[in-house]
């Protein structure tokens, strides 16, 4: 059958019918339904929600909906032995203790099973010592402390403010600096937007609000006990000492009221510059230790959380393709939340639910997509992307042969200012074309396209008249699909104005105050931004699954490869003498990029001209497009990060959330001037240039004429 025969709705109306079926009111209703109680991974409540979603997806009309379960390592506070931090006097008496829980929001006072704030996977321990304030605990913050200020964190408890980078990187940096404990806190400078009230009167973080989150450094491994393989019934599990990515020192998060009590007494060095000052009314002294009259007081952590192998459940729904059932387009987002999940993840899960309902409605009318669409409700994302990673590990052979694209669907909103998209360059043109067809929900852009408002509010730094599209990093469920398996991936959500709101994420992220009311009262009362995100995510899935020729443009990859090569070359050229001494050349990389550009251009010409009625040629061309992302995968992975295998993109080694281009070369060059053996260090740079050049050339050749 041709794709036109697979449906009783004419092709040009397919997408319109799908988009018209999406309703803001339904998204609102689903969000309410998903946020009335906590859905923490590994709990009965989250299992019940999985079964509810399974049942509803079946009702919506999917061909099959199955639960896929795994037994993975999770982490929970001890219910009878709470975690807290104390200030102790010289006699060891606790003279101040941090809060044991967040004051519940109005209307939720009687809800049970609200997990108190904790850092998931923290080891147990009761370290005591002097405090050192380490700003955001970024690599550069520790460089400043250790190299410039000569402050030694060894044997100290460090206090770091949340924001800028993934919390797991903060903990890793603290460990490497020799700290014996980490206190994470939310500073109002990062989590309290000026002129906005605290929840429940506004969307700002109250002083008792605390951000939960995992502190792992998994580097794409999934379940810490079964790296590379699914955590199934017959899995061989590592001992806890060999588990991947677990922190070795106790870690605990607090709010800014408690942080004030710890920071106000800090003595020692003054902050090195204004970038180390937050918005609390304290001097932000670095320490170590407390000032003058308080110098005999110490900080003590009391951490009693436990790591437990626990069953988790993904929901996997299938809508079989009519023409190419062995080609998979995947829409996935997680279901587990830290507490109510008003934004993260349920604003995303509600959108997925409505997308499934719309596809189901079309299917009931006799339509089918050309390719198979898989829908996923992932579990245990908050504990390290575990549900998605285990499922991908279990199905890796199918996915690497059949995976066309993965669209992520976590939080639909992190603000209400404009669209934000991160994706593979292969999807740039798809996103541009789609957003030109969608109406903008923004005030002042009535009757204008989403593309227009997005471009105006978030312009590309390189290309005028185009919107900014960012690199994929990690910290979400696309990771295994893109970074490990090389499946073209993308994500879209509505975001804040990054120019005026310099706080990190949204203020109530991972707190008890992330409720339905937060969204309904303050972020999106009409659910128009949710609807727009549903149209973008759903529209991308629709096109990827239904277009005769895959909507990938390989020429856009050529453009970014040149940009990334220029960037990494300019970083290397900060060391011209060493490049000369060690004969470091980027010629091979630039040559490979040039070849890729030429071959991609010719491929695109052939793509315009070939006979689309010939199913063999069509499939051949589509396979070349599908497998292009796969061609950037190095089976050996990146140094010390075997599950990050994409040569063009990887999560930054200094911030899991951020994407880095040519990460192998970048990491080899990072801080190279401090390496004890420069010859060895520059040798690794040369090796990484070789790997990158080979990979780009090899990828280019996959686009050449096959014979």
């Amino acid at each position: 059958k041709s794709s036109n025969e697979a449906t009783n709705i004419t092709p040009k109306h397919n997408m319109k019918a799908f988009l018209d079926e999406l309703k803001a009111e339904n998204i609102k209703k689903f969000l309410y339904n998903f946020t009335q109680i906590p859905h923490l991974a590994g709990t009965e409540q989250n299992f019940q929600l999985a079964k509810q979603i399974q049942s509803q997806w079946k009702e919506f009309g999917l061909d099959s909906v199955e639960l896929a379960h795994y037994d993975v390592l999770l982490s929970y506070p001890n219910k009878t032995h709470p975690n807290y931090i104390s200030i102790i006097n010289e006699d060891g008496n606790e003279i101040f203790n941090t809060s044991l829980f967040e004051p519940p929001p109005p209307g939720y006072e009687n809800v049970s099973d609200i997990v108190p704030p904790f850092s998931a996977f923290s080891p147990q321990g009761m370290p005591e010592g002097d405090l050192v304030y380490v700003n955001y605990a970024r690599t550069e913050d520790f460089f400043k402390l250790e190299r410039d200020m000569k402050i030694n964190c060894s044997g100290k408890i460090v206090i770091a403010r949340y924001g800028k980078v993934f919390r797991g990187n903060k903990v890793k940096n603290a460990q490497l600096a020799g700290a014996k404990g980490v206190i994470l806190y939310s500073d109002p400078a990062d989590y309290f937007a000026p002129g906005v009230k605290s929840y429940p009167d506004g969307w700002n973080l109250p002083g008792g609000g605390v951000q939960r989150g995992n502190i792992l450094n998994l580097n794409g491994a999934g379940d810490p006990l079964t790296p590379g393989y699914p955590a199934n019934e017959y899995a061989y599990r590592r001992g806890i000492a060999e588990a991947v990515g677990l922190p070795s020192i106790p870690v605990h998060p607090i709010g800014y009221y408690d942080a004030q009590k710890l920071l106000e007494k800090m003595g020692g060095s003054a902050p090195p510059d204004s970038s180390w000052r937050g918005s609390l009314k304290v001097p932000y002294n670095v320490g170590p230790g407390f000032t003058g009259n308080f110098s005999t007081q110490k900080v003590k952590m009391h951490i009693h959380s436990t790591n437990e192998v626990t069953r988790i459940y993904n929901v996997i729904g299938t809508l079989r393709g009519a023409v190419e059932p062995d080609r998979y387009v995947i829409l996935g987002g997680h279901r587990d939340s830290w507490v109510f999940g008003g934004i993260d993840p349920q604003s995303g899960a509600a959108v997925v639910h409505e997308i499934v309902r719309s596809f189901g409605t079309l299917k009931k009318e006799g339509w089918r997509p050309r390719r198979t669409i898989l829908f996923a409700s992932w579990d245990a994302e908050e504990f390290g992307l575990l549900g998605s990673t285990e499922w991908a590990e279990e199905n890796s052979r199918l996915l690497q042969e059949r995976g066309v694209a993965y669209i992520n669907a976590d939080s639909s909103i992190e603000g209400n200012y404009t669209l934000r998209v991160d994706c593979t360059p292969l999807m740039y043109s798809l996103v541009h074309n789609l957003t030109k067809e969608l109406k903008s929900p923004d005030e002042g852009f009535e009757g204008k396209s989403l593309y227009e408002s997005w471009t105006k509010k978030s312009p590309s730094p390189e290309f005028s008249g185009m919107p900014r599209i960012s690199k994929l990093g990690s910290g979400n469920d696309f990771e295994v699909f893109f970074q490990r398996l090389g499946i073209a991936s993308g994500r879209a959500r509505y975001t804040k104005n990054w120019e005026t709101n310099k706080f990190s994420g949204y203020p109530l992220y991972h707190s008890v105050y992330e409720t339905y009311e937060l969204v309904e009262k303050f972020y999106d009362p009409m659910f128009k931004y949710h609807l727009t995100v549903a149209q973008v995510r759903g529209g991308m899935v629709f096109e990827l699954a239904n277009s005769i020729v895959l909507p990938f443009d390989c020429r856009d990859y050529a453009v970014v490869l040149r940009k990334y090569a220029d960037k990494i070359y300019s970083i290397s050229m900060k060391h011209p003498q060493e490049m000369k001494t060690y004969s470091v050349s980027f010629d091979s990389l630039f040559s490979a990029v040039k070849n890729f550009t030429e071959i991609a251009s010719k491929f695109s010409e052939r793509l315009q001209d070939f006979d689309k009625s010939n199913p063999i040629v069509l499939r051949m061309m589509n396979d070349q497009l599908m497998f292009l992302e796969r061609a950037f995968i190095d089976p050996l992975g990146l140094p010390d990060r075997p599950f990050y295998r994409h040569v063009i993109y990887a999560p930054s080694s200094h911030n899991k959330y951020a994407g880095e281009s040519f990460p192998g070369i970048y990491d080899a060059l990072f801080d190279i001037e401090s390496k004890v053996d420069p010859s060895k260090a520059w040798g690794e740079v040369k090796r990484q240039i070789y790997v990158a050049a080979f990979t780009v050339q090899a990828a280019a050749e996959t686009l050449s004429e096959v014979a």
Epitope: I87, I95, S198
Partner: antibody
């Protein structure tokens, strides 16, 4: 030497608002919080609010607004819907190490019809 | 809110007397207890912070002790300039509260 200088006495009608200022000098304004304390005639001291971003005593929630202008090192306390019971001396005080180490001279606010 | 109960509400004493004022918190406040002296028509003055630390410039006849819920301000030898009203303040919780005051009068 740290100094907190408050604005002058005010006479206000019931239902109106009053805004008292407190200008700090002698130390970094951003290093320490300013809180507000009031004292009705013949009565004890009553903490109204302070800290960062801002925290108010339950009794004054919704009626008091505490703000600061970092550029002029000035803190402000605005009390709305005034009633006769709000007649008091209003003090600003610097919060250091969870104590008020320096106080303003006080501003008498009289609420009378 | 944490309640602070000061006692006595007033006392009469002579110059040279040892005077003790107590303050009880309705819950544990660690050592987050301050003592203030106020004279008529004047702003309060910090005497003791963190339960027992003497504020710079305050005579050593003033001392503070206690932790948890029970605290004491002691004036070892009352001087003429010490006749005033004394207040305790808890600063442990996010909502700070004063005691109702103790008036020290001349006997």
């Amino acid at each position: 030497q740290v100094q907190l200088v408050q604005s002058g006495a005010e006479v206000k009608k019931p239902g109106s608002s009053v805004k008292v200022s407190c200008k700090a000098s002698g130390d970094s304004f951003s290093n320490y919080g300013i809180s507000w304390v009031r004292q009705a005639p013949g009565q004890g001291l009553e903490w109204m609010g302070g800290f960062t971003p801002v925290n108010y005593a339950q009794k004054f929630q919704g009626r008091v607004t505490i703000t600061a202008d970092e550029s002029t090192s000035t803190a402000y306390m605005e009390l709305s819907s005034l009633r006769s019971e709000d007649t008091a001396v209003y003090y600003c005080a610097r919060d250091r190490w969870s104590s008020f180490d320096y106080w303003g001279q006080g501003t008498l606010v009289t609420v009378s019809s | 809110d944490i309640q602070m109960t000061q006692s006595p509400s007033s006392l009469s004493a002579s110059v040279g007397d040892r005077v003790t004022i107590t303050c009880r918190a309705s819950q544990n406040i660690g050592s987050y207890l301050n003592w203030y002296q106020q004279k008529p028509g004047k702003a309060p003055k910090l005497l003791i912070y963190a339960a027992s630390i003497l504020q710079s410039g305050v005579p050593s006849r003033f001392s503070g002790s206690g932790s948890g819920t029970d605290f004491t301000l002691t004036i070892s030898s009352l001087q003429p300039e010490d006749f005033a009203t004394y207040y305790c303040l808890q600063s442990y919780s996010t909502l700070w509260t004063f005691g109702q005051g103790t008036k020290v009068e001349i006997k």
